[in-house]
Amino acid sequence: CTCVPPHPQTAFCNSDLVIRAKFVGTPEVNQTTLYQRYEIKMTKMYKGFQALGDAADIRFVYTPAMESVCGYFHRSHNRSEEFLIAGKLQDGLLHITTCSFVAPWNSLSLAQRRGFTKTYTVGCEECTVFPCLSIPCKLQSGTHCLWTDQLLQGSEKGFQSRHLACLPREPGLCTWQSLRSQIA
């Protein structure tokens, strides 16, 4: 199972639920579905209030039981380490795959943290991060922001991923904007 890591804004916008959590238990396999379940302790919710309701507490995250079908394998044994988890809701349960955005909170730049906390949501409705995988590539719409990180380096470590968000400049136009300048 292979997939290109998305821009964090894309991960935020395409997910039903975005939370900060610690992985606290040994994974278990559900025999009825052959999904594995990780026990988590949620510390913050950034997206999904309406889907879940304000009082909701996510205690488990679900993923396919095998790597070949995009199951997520959590490699860290540090149970106090916080992770940003962006996933999908299926029957009220949080599901992730290898292709989901799951990253140690401490590995995120201050700009990315700001994005998940506050800013990415502003761009979800109108704007689209458009991956440029090979040259030449051109914008197909004024609401697209051309994401070129993959051309230069690993997509998660690129400047646009770590410091920029695709946000509305005016109706029908989105541009890359610095998240740094928005950090109070």
């Epitope: 040994t26 994974p27 396999v29 025999q31 009825t32 579905t33 052959l34 999904y35 594995q36 396919p64 039981a65 095998m66 790597e67 070949s68 079908v69 199951g71 394998f73 490699r75």
Partner: antibody, heavy 113, light 111 residues
């Protein structure tokens, strides 16, 4: 008590097909993932395939992928393994097993011309 | 292709204790609490002796015990008896290959 009974083994020519069955009793069949595991003569154990309790997910070992199909009929408490394009190296005792615990007595499959 | 490493053979005298190791990786033995041990006498089906690392099914003697440390699981048989002579296989759930086995260990009871 929990019991698994395999059937359907036998002698088959290379390239041929065979369907194994496993009748389960003594437990809530649809709550458990079920596997097929095989053991070639004088060799160790090799996992072949697994199916989820509800039948929606199936996984296969690389050695049988595309040739074998696992299925189940929860109304009959029965597990199946359809084996096509059989090869000499598929010769083994095939065991039906509940996920990570109870096994049947096995059925011998011999692939030879 | 054997995924879990077991010693090919171990031996002990009646009454002694022996331990069989089973070494894997963080994606199998080390990552989950799903390690089982089976006893297989010649010509017979494997019999479950330990499941979920250290649990004994009903009917299995308390002389058999299981444990795990890191990526290595162990089966200990105390008060060795003649009928314990058999092949022993470890098995683990594995994230990459779903289910993996050790190559088997032949236990010989001396005397």
């Amino acid at each position: 008590q929990v019991q698994l009974v395999e059937s359907g083994g036998g002698l088959v020519q290379p390239g041929g097909s065979l369907r194994l069955s496993c009748a389960a009793s003594g437990f809530t069949f649809n709550s458990y993932a079920m596997s097929w595991v095989r053991q070639a003569p004088g060799k160790g154990l090799e996992w072949v395939s697994v199916i989820s309790g509800n039948g929606s997910n199936t996984y296969y070992a690389d050695s049988v992928k595309g040739r074998f199909t696992i299925s189940r009929d929860n109304s009959k408490n029965t597990l199946y393994l359809q084996m096509n394009s059989l090869r000499a190296e598929d010769t083994a005792v095939y065991y039906c097993a509940r996920f990570l615990d109870i096994w049947g007595q096995g059925t011998l499959v011999t692939v030879s011309s | 292709d054997i995924a879990l490493t077991q010693p090919a053979s171990v031996s002990g005298s009646p009454g002694q204790s022996i331990t069989i190791s089973c070494t894997g990786t963080s994606s199998d033995v080390g990552g989950y609490n799903y390690v089982s041990w089976y006893q297989q006498h010649p010509g017979k089906a494997p019999k479950l002796m330990i499941y979920d690392v250290s649990n004994r099914p009903s009917g299995v003697s308390n002389r058999f015990s299981g444990s795990k440390s890191g990526n290595t699981a162990s089966l200990t048989i105390s008060g060795l008896q003649a009928e314990d002579e058999a092949d022993y296989y470890c098995q683990s759930y594995d994230f990459v290959r779903f289910m993996v086995f050790g190559g088997g260990t032949k236990l010989t009871v001396l005397g």
